[in-house]
Structure formats: structure tokens, C-alpha cells
């Protein structure tokens, strides 16, 4: 039997301070741009070498964006996503969701030293 | 990972146009940030245009601006340059280059750092 993939999914509020070249990341998605089935949130897509994001270390690829600054990310469209961003002034508050792939062993069993649970 | 593959270059005369097209790998298509770019033997890799993950933004070096057209099918995972009334000074190597998504930041377009995938080019040569 195939061990199932398993997600563990934890929030976290990441305080960027906006660097010589900007935050240092791309996103998508968004209402006219959904990235995930039945799911027009907001995705970061490329942490940029050197940048802001990449030097405080937190955030990753894959990681969903909720809110900036406080303010939700839910159902913009993906241009006024990227305009919030470039808007958000010199420092950034994130609140990101990271969903981390957890393999376990068959259905039915743990295997011993699995930490899920 | 994002395969590129360029091509309709060739020979041509002064005045004469070329349509060039760029297909690119993967699912994400439409969320590509794209750009194509050009080297002539001898000098440093040049922006030539660049187009947003919809198509409706676009950006033009001067030396091509009025031109040359950048355009995508999102359909068919494929971007274009449309370059009319060629001259000598555009033979060169042309690529296409992609980043993933639209960068958050003020976007330096022609900065070749700031895409992350690249072609093999294909050469236009003006004559």
C-alpha cells in the first residue's frame, strides 16, 4: 500500500523592511490569475537571491500570502494584488500561511519515528 | 522547471520583417513574466521588450520602439516578437526569458538578472 502525503499547515507574521531593490519576490494568482484549483489566493512564486525576503529567510516559494499590512488579500484580482505590495510603504507586515508536505507511512500505520502525530 | 524554444529567425534584407516565436514548458504558462533579449558578437546581452503575464503591459528598448511588437498566446504557451522594417543593427542572437509570477517589486524589466529561465536563442541576421 502507498504512504499517504500529508500537509502541515502553520501561519506566521513575517516583518519585512523594503530593501534597495524592493521586498525581492514575485507572486501569483488572484481572481483572473488562479494558480491552485478553487483558489484565487494570493502564492509567492520566486524568492529573489539577495533580496529583502531572501535575507530575512522566512518566507518561501509556495508559501500563501493572507494579508499586507493588515489588509486581506482575499478575492483581487492578481494587477491590484502587485499594486498592494508596491504600495505597502518601507516596512511590509506578512501574514503568510506555509504548507509543509508531510509523507507518512501506509494507510492505517505510523511508522515509528513519524513526528505527525 | 521551464523549458524555452525559440525560433523564426534567418537571413534577411534591410526593411524586411521577421515574426519570432518563443514556446515555453509548463502548466503556469499564463503566470510567466516574459521577455525577449538579444546579443550581437562582441557586446553585452540587450533588452529588447517584455510583456506581463496577461498581455497587457508591454515595454520597448528605444532602439526597437514603433517596430518591433511583443505579443502571447496564453492558449498555446507561446510568446512572439513581431520586428518590422529590420536594419543592420538588429542582427544579433534573440532569447526569450521568463520569471514565474510578476515580481512585487518596481519591475526592471530590462534587467537580465531578473529572469530566471532562458532559450537557446535564435539568430537574425539583417543584411
Known amino acids: 500500500m502507498n504512504g499517504r502525503v500529508d500537509y502541515l499547515v502553520t501561519e506566521e507574521e513575517i516583518n519585512l523592511t523594503r530593501g534597495p531593490s524592493g521586498l525581492g519576490f514575485n507572486i501569483v494568482g488572484g481572481t483572473d490569475q488562479q494558480y491552485v484549483s478553487n483558489d484565487s489566493g494570493i502564492y509567492v512564486s520566486r524568492i529573489k537571491e539577495n533580496g529583502a525576503a531572501a535575507l530575512d529567510g522566512r518566507l518561501q516559494e509556495g508559501d500563501k500570502i493572507l494579508s499586507v499590512n493588515g489588509q486581506d488579500l482575499k478575492n483581487l484580482l492578481h494587477q491590484d494584488a502587485v499594486d498592494l505590495f508596491r504600495n505597502a510603504g518601507y516596512a511590509v507586515s506578512l501574514r503568510v500561511q506555509h504548507r509543509l508536505q508531510v509523507q507518512n507511512g501506509p494507510i492505517g500505520h505510523r511508522g515509528e519515528g513519524d513526528p505527525s502525530g | 522547471h521551464v523549458q524555452l524554444v525559440e525560433s523564426g529567425g534567418g537571413l534577411v534584407q534591410a526593411g524586411d520583417s521577421l515574426r519570432l516565436s518563443c514556446a515555453a514548458s509548463?502548466?503556469?504558462?499564463?503566470?510567466?513574466?516574459m521577455g525577449w533579449f538579444r546579443q550581437a558578437p562582441g557586446k553585452e546581452r540587450e533588452f529588447v521588450a517584455h510583456?506581463?503575464?496577461?498581455?497587457?503591459?508591454?515595454y520597448y528598448a528605444d532602439s526597437v520602439k514603433g517596430r518591433f511588437t511583443i505579443s502571447r498566446d496564453n492558449a498555446k504557451n507561446t510568446m512572439y516578437l513581431q520586428m518590422n522594417s529590420l536594419k543592420p543593427d538588429d542582427t544579433a542572437v534573440y532569447y526569450c526569458?521568463?520569471?514565474?509570477?510578476?515580481?512585487?517589486?518596481?519591475?526592471?524589466?530590462?534587467?537580465?538578472?531578473?529572469?530566471?529561465?532562458w532559450g537557446q536563442g535564435t539568430q537574425v541576421t539583417v543584411s
Open positions: 510583456i506581463n503575464w496577461s498581455g497587457s503591459s508591454t
Open positions: 526569458a521568463v520569471t514565474i509570477g510578476s515580481p512585487v517589486d518596481s519591475y526592471r524589466h530590462s534587467d537580465p538578472l531578473e529572469y530566471d529561465y
Open positions: 509548463g502548466r503556469t504558462f499564463s503566470t510567466y513574466t
